[in-house]
Interface confidence: low
């Protein structure tokens, strides 16, 4: 393995991810790692000198850039919120605020808009499909022995509480939109009316 800076015949460096061809000196030089930028360009005798990106800037990849990219905050006006802050080697990670979903352009989430979601009524739940879609939700009734008591796009039907497991007895049966109500069993020897 050659150590930069080194001369090369065909202008193709050995490790193209971490090295680049510097035509001024006709040598292969080191790129700077993520989070750094070129502080001093290489020469025939000295390799690239890198330095950490200044505060509020970043470079995500191995590079021979003489600047770092300026960190951009997640744009609240466009409906984004910050998941992870900008660091010297990555830009801020943004996602849509709760209740909003992405509008994509060329595979990039350019802004967020309020979700126009179908709310599944109590007693129903959103049908689970392979496609992860936030729109065109199909609501289906809870299966027997299950209930769902909210108006929600994402709530799932839950199994009814089984009173006997808790040493209780059923006071009122569960429905598709309400849970079973349990009560303490009668005292032994108590008169049954």
């Amino acid at each position: 393995q050659l150590v930069p800076p080194y001369r090369i015949e065909n202008q193709t460096c050995w490790d193209q991810d971490k090295e680049y061809y510097e035509p001024m000196h006709d040598v292969c030089c080191s790129r700077c790692p993520p989070g750094e930028f070129v502080f001093a360009v290489c020469s025939r005798s000295q390799d690239t000198v890198c330095k950490t990106c200044p505060h509020n800037s970043y470079n995500e990849h191995w590079n021979h850039l003489s600047t770092c990219q300026l960190c951009r905050p997640c744009d609240i006006v466009l409906g984004f919120e910050e998941v992870a802050p900008c660091t010297s080697d990555r830009k801020a990670e943004c996602r849509c605020q709760p209740g909003m979903s992405c509008v994509y352009l060329d595979n990039e989430c350019v802004h967020c808009e309020e979700e126009r979601l179908v709310l599944c009524q109590p007693g129903t739940e959103a049908e689970v499909t392979d496609e992860i879609m936030d729109t065109d939700v199909n609501c289906v009734p809870c299966k027997p022995g299950h209930f769902q008591n909210t108006s929600s796009p994402r709530a799932r039907c839950q199994p009814h509480t089984r009173c006997e497991i808790q040493g209780l007895v059923e006071a009122a049966p569960g429905t598709s939109y309400s849970d079973t109500i349990c009560k303490n069993p009668p005292e032994p020897g108590a008169m049954l009316l």
Epitope: E36, A40, C50, K51, P54, H55, S66
Partner: antibody, heavy 120, light 113 residues
Framework: QVQLVQSGAEVKKPGSSVKVSCKAS????????ISWVRQAPGQGLEWMGG????????NYAQKFQGRVTITADKSTSTAYMELSSLRSEDTAVYYC?????????????WGQGTTVTVSS | DIVMTQSPDSLAVSLGERATINCKSS????????????LAWYQQKPGQPPKLLIY???TRESGVPDRFSGSGSGTDFTLTISSLQAEDVAVYYC?????????FGQGTKVEIK
């Protein structure tokens, strides 16, 4: 050859503000951090803050935070340092300086200095 | 911020003799990625702005006489004037540029004995 030319001496009253300019010539202005360093009479060098015109963001020494504002006008290749709420201990020579390598390296170009006197 | 401490505060040396100035940083200014020390030395004469002498702790600025040399690594650095000349009377400062908040030592005044 890079040259940094600063504005002339100032006499100011306590509580007022002063704005010192530093005009750069003979180099790429935007690509280098311009630093401001001051020196009180008989004292050492004290870094106040700096600005990288290409980014437009300034950073300041903790001591001067909130009292100093450093700006840069790329169209005229001029950097400015404004110090507010002046007191007598701000009497000093104020220098602008910049590196010859990209961004924020050793300072090899210095302005001639601007004397600011704060006196009632 | 990184604190730079110089010693001594002042130094009187005979013409032609060696002058040694020390500088200590509160944290290392050696950058492991490139094995370089982000430390510079400046000379300042009365009524003049500082002049760069040394960068990368030991690299002489072009035009600086070779009687000036810098050494050290990590947190401990030295500026040596091997044979003091009359024109070397000045205040000398070390400075780190490891962080974007530059800091300077308090200065060492070099005089002729």
């Amino acid at each position: 050859q890079v040259q940094l030319v600063q504005s002339g001496a100032e006499v100011k009253k306590p509580g007022s503000s002063v704005k010192v300019s530093c005009k750069a010539s003979g180099g790429t202005f935007s690509s280098y951090a311009i630093s401001w360093v001051r020196q009180a009479p008989g004292q050492g060098l004290e870094w106040m803050g700096g600005i990288i015109p290409i980014f437009g963001t300034a950073n300041y020494a903790q001591k001067f935070q909130g009292r100093v504002t450093i700006t840069a006008d790329k169209s005229t290749s001029t950097a400015y340092m404004e110090l507010s709420s002046l007191r007598s201990e701000d009497t000093a020579v104020y220098y602008c300086a910049r590196p010859s390598y990209y961004l924020d390296g050793w300072l090899d170009y210095w302005g001639q200095g601007t004397t600011v006197t704060v006196s009632s | 911020d990184i604190v730079m401490t110089q010693s001594p505060d002042s130094l009187a040396v005979s013409l032609g003799e060696r002058a040694t100035i020390n500088c200590k940083s509160s944290q290392s200014v050696l950058y492991s990625s490139n094995n370089k020390n982000y430390l510079a030395w400046y000379q300042q004469k009365p009524g003049q702005p500082p002049k760069l002498l040394i960068y990368w702790a030991s690299t002489r600025e072009s035009g600086v006489p070779d009687r000036f040399s810098g050494s050290g690594s990590g947190t401990d650095f030295t500026l040596t004037i091997s044979s003091l000349q009359a024109e070397d009377v000045a205040v000398y400062y070390c400075s780190q540029y490891y962080t974007t908040h530059y800091t300077f030592g308090q200065g060492t005044k070099v005089e002729i004995k």
